[in-house]
Amino acid sequence: SEVEYIAEVGQNAYLPCSYTPAPPGNLVPVCWGKGACPVFDCSNVVLRTDNRDVNDRTSGRYWLKGDFHKGDVSLTIENVTLADSGVYCCRIQIPGIMNDEKHNVKLVVIKPAKVTPAPTLQRDLTSAFPRMLTTGEHGPAETQTPGSLPDVNLTVSNFFCELQIFTLTNELRDSGATIRTA
């Protein structure tokens, strides 16, 4: 089953996908589509690359912000809405019969959490929830959402690596914030 990624309405969503160009610089076409990966190509294409650059996108909200030339073809969807929820297909179109790498990732878009900060809290908690947590070179991992804040570290496996997701529990306790789920 596909890996789930969570983003809040109005935030940017990050859906990871990558490959290793072999040899380096030898890029292959990639497509991102809304819906699970079909037999061929991508259906409902939202973004497509060729051997050099992005050559097709259905909206200015879809971006590849990683190092495209090193094979980082992770999709960023800006200013997400509830309608962006669903399964997305990242298809790395390696030449040859049935050689494509197909990755399904699921985006769950949630309504903004109602966060009532204590008077002493100086920073904007809206941007702290949800928060993409960067762990090393692979970029943002999964978003931690309010409503269920575990006290344990959660290990998430995706196609490429295992990422440690750390909760914001202690930070919130320190700030004195009151969390109410939407």
Partner: antibody
């Protein structure tokens, strides 16, 4: 307006050959996967073969592998299906389609009859 | 090869009534499923793709639903031009396969 016009069908003896053509217009042919789907008389639909935009990848249903060859000429906006070693069970209307996974545009079809 | 099972084989409905057609598989297709309409002597016409998205120019009385292994095509109020054969087609697994069809006939 999208148009797909098949030609080349007819009556052929078992073991014989035919070449079907499909002339495309009204869309950017070179950007589109193209597909052949067939329908035996009074029967359902069967996907036969498809071909990627540049012709670099071709896929076939098992029953026609090694006998049928799909090809395209992007300069002429044309799709082809070379059918060799034809069998009675290849008798069908052959449709040309644009698309890779599902098919939004269909030609009117051309009938291939394999009979002695 | 993935077998797509459509039911019923024939559906007798009066004009203005609702028709519900079923397409089942033994495997998860997510939403990689399309529906087509075919009238005698004509090529099929795409109605629905992605299990629920209406193709261009398709009237709102046609709707698709379901995901995974069970899918439904609903025609909310049958018009005279809707009496035809309907096929589902999966595009999640190779080879692409069609269901055997459901004939919607006038009651």
């Amino acid at each position: 307006e999208v148009q797909l016009v098949e030609s080349g069908g007819g009556l052929v003896q078992p073991g014989g050959s035919l070449r079907l053509s499909c002339a495309a217009s009204g869309f950017t042919f070179s950007n589109s996967w193209m597909t052949w789907v067939r329908q035996a008389p009074g029967k359902g639909l069967e996907w036969v073969a498809n071909i990627k935009q540049a012709g670099t990848e071709k896929y076939y249903v098992d029953s026609v592998k090694g006998r049928f060859t799909i090809s395209r000429d992007n300069a002429k906006n044309s799709l082809y299906l070379q059918m060799n070693s034809l069998r009675a069970e290849d008798t069908a209307v052959y449709y040309c389609n644009s698309g890779s996974n599902y098919f939004d545009y269909w030609g009117q079809g051309t009938l291939v009859t394999v009979s002695s | 090869e993935i077998v797509m099972t459509q039911s019923p084989a024939t559906l007798s409905v009066s004009p203005g009534e609702r028709a519900t057609l079923s397409c089942r598989a033994r495997q998860n297709f997510y939403s990689n499923l399309a529906w087509y309409q075919q009238k005698p002597g004509q090529a099929p016409r795409l109605l629905i793709y992605g299990a629920s998205t209406r193709a261009t120019g398709i009237p709102a009385r046609f709707s698709g639903s379901g995901s995974g292994t069970e899918f439904t095509l609903t025609i909310s109020s049958l018009q005279s031009e809707d009496f035809a054969v309907y096929y589902c087609q999966q595009y999640n697994n190779w080879p692409l396969t069609f269901g055997g069809g459901t004939k919607v006939e006038i009651k």
